[in-house]
Interface confidence: medium
């Protein structure tokens, strides 16, 4: 019914606020930030992949999740230069329809994959620390790998709307070719659904699971310390737990708030161009915060482990890994030297470190 070829695109007028989010400082600042995220992210995540796969030989459940987290980040980072150019060109998409779909799907995929992986990592930490014996059979490499496959499939499913509905088209009154969602009338409620899905499935539920997992870990460790009254208390563990939860929360909350405001604008609840301008201006900034922190996650989580830290620094000094075969059978526990559920009197070690990758 409507010719929407990539050459001609869809000729149409933009809505009320054509200048919303279109500021010169955005067109300079955002591409600069994207470039920094790209360089730091590619470097950091590539090293994480090398350390976990070649040095640490992918032996633990936590390392499987971290490896997948780094790989998901790398998939996203590869499309970041396209978004940098797009923003620098004042939201003009020069790369064609195919790359528009791929790059858009990559952003959505990374959000869901990384959030789901962090959630699974928090559940794994909970099982390993609070129920080390009970969960030994469940926390196998096979289960971890299958979980990762399911996560990638779910993230892929969540990215399908971008592949289907993201298109390159021409906006009449601003004379620009954009890479954006386009819906025929029967799908016009879809962007609202996508925004709310991002809020609920991409943040609210995972955050509640992460918060619950680390709260239960906190309580278990506190209980262990109370039993071991004669041992010095290691507050580092509690600081790490706080850091993990707060880092996740503050990374994503700005983007999630503005996504929700965007939904309210889409619904017509907010009709003020000034608010639309604030939302459209803030959105790329919140994306920078969320995805930059996201790309730092493998490093952040990895550095909680002593072996990871050692291998990472070793790699930076160009020391090759020892020739050692990959062990798929190893389901070595990746957590406490002392565990709250063990017999307290037989242990003389203090409860640390609880977040080792290996």
């Amino acid at each position: 019914i409507l010719n929407s070829s990539t050459e001609d695109g869809i000729k149409r007028i933009q809505d009320d606020c054509p200048k919303a989010g279109r500021h010169n400082y955005i067109f300079v600042m955002i591409p600069t930030l994207y470039s920094i995220i790209f360089v730091v992210g590619i470097f950091g995540n590539s090293l994480v992949v090398i350390v976990i796969y070649f040095y640490m030989k992918l032996k633990t459940v936590a390392s499987v999740f971290l490896l997948n987290l780094a790989l998901a980040d790398l998939c996203f980072l590869l499309t970041l230069p396209l978004w940098a150019v797009y923003t620098a060109m004042e939201y003009r998409w020069p790369f064609g329809n195919y790359l528009c779909k791929i790059a858009s799907a990559s952003v959505s995929f990374n959000l869901y994959a990384s959030v789901f992986l962090l959630t699974c990592l928090s559940i794994d930490r909970y099982l390993a620390i609070v129920h080390p014996m009970k969960s030994r059979l469940r926390r196998t490499m096979l289960v971890a790998k299958v979980t990762c496959i399911i996560i990638w499939l779910l993230a892929g499913l969540a990215s399908l709307p971008a592949i289907i509905h993201r298109n390159v088209f021409f906006i009449e009154n601003t004379n620009i070719t954009v890479c954006a969602f386009h819906y025929e009338s029967q799908n016009s409620t879809l962007p609202i659904g996508l925004g709310l899905t991002k809020n609920i499935l991409g943040f609210l539920f995972p955050f509640l699971i992460i918060l619950t997992s680390y709260t239960l870990i906190w309580k278990a460790l506190k209980k262990a310390y109370e039993i071991q009254k004669n041992k010095p208390r290691n507050d580092d563990i509690f600081k790490i737990i706080m850091a993990i939860v707060l880092f996740f929360f503050f990374s994503w909350i700005p983007h999630q708030i503005f996504t929700f405001l965007d939904v309210l604008i889409q619904l017509g609840i907010i009709r003020d161009c000034r608010i639309a301008d604030i939302v459209d201006t803030a959105m790329p900034i919140t994306i920078c915060i969320a995805y930059f922190n996201n790309c730092l996650n493998p490093l952040f989580y990895g550095f909680l482990g002593k072996k990871f830290k050692r291998y990472f620094l070793q790699l930076l000094k160009y020391i090759p890994p020892k020739a050692k075969s990959h062990s798929n059978l190893s389901t070595k526990m990746s957590t406490l030297s002392y565990r709250p559920s063990d017999n307290v009197s037989s242990s003389t070690k203090k409860p640390a470190p609880c977040f080792e990758v290996e």
Partner: nanobody
């Protein structure tokens, strides 16, 4: 679901005038723009004129100065006043409602025939 109902089409002589109306009914989720597209026999559908909720107007070069678009937000209706009509304006005129800032959608009417005889 949104329905768009066009009216006002018909047969007119070259140089004459016509006024098309398009009424939107049903619940619309978004702030939306409205406008007109046309499709002549054997040709692709082309943009004619559009007007945003805030009454920002936009016209195709071929109709500038001859056609005027306006809207009544209270009635959810858009009008296209067509003056100095030419035979090349002969086409099926489609009413459209669309919206979005980063997300876009479009609703279509069934179309109304405008024939300009020479």
């Amino acid at each position: 679901q949104v329905q768009l109902q066009e009216s006002g089409g018909g047969l007119v002589q070259a140089g004459g005038s016509l006024r098309l109306s398009c009424a939107a009914s049903g619940y619309i989720f978004y702030r939306y723009s409205m406008g007109w597209y046309r499709q002549a026999p054997g040709k692709e559908r082309e943009f004619v004129a559009g007007i945003s909720y805030g009454a920002t107007t936009n016209y195709a070069d071929s109709v500038k100065g001859r056609f005027t678009i306006s809207r009544d937000n209270a009635k959810n209706t858009v009008y296209l006043q067509m003056n100095s009509l030419k035979p090349e304006d002969t086409a099926v005129y489609y009413c459209a409602a669309w919206g979005g800032r980063t997300d876009y959608f479009v609703y279509w009417g069934q179309g109304t025939q405008v024939t300009v005889s020479s």
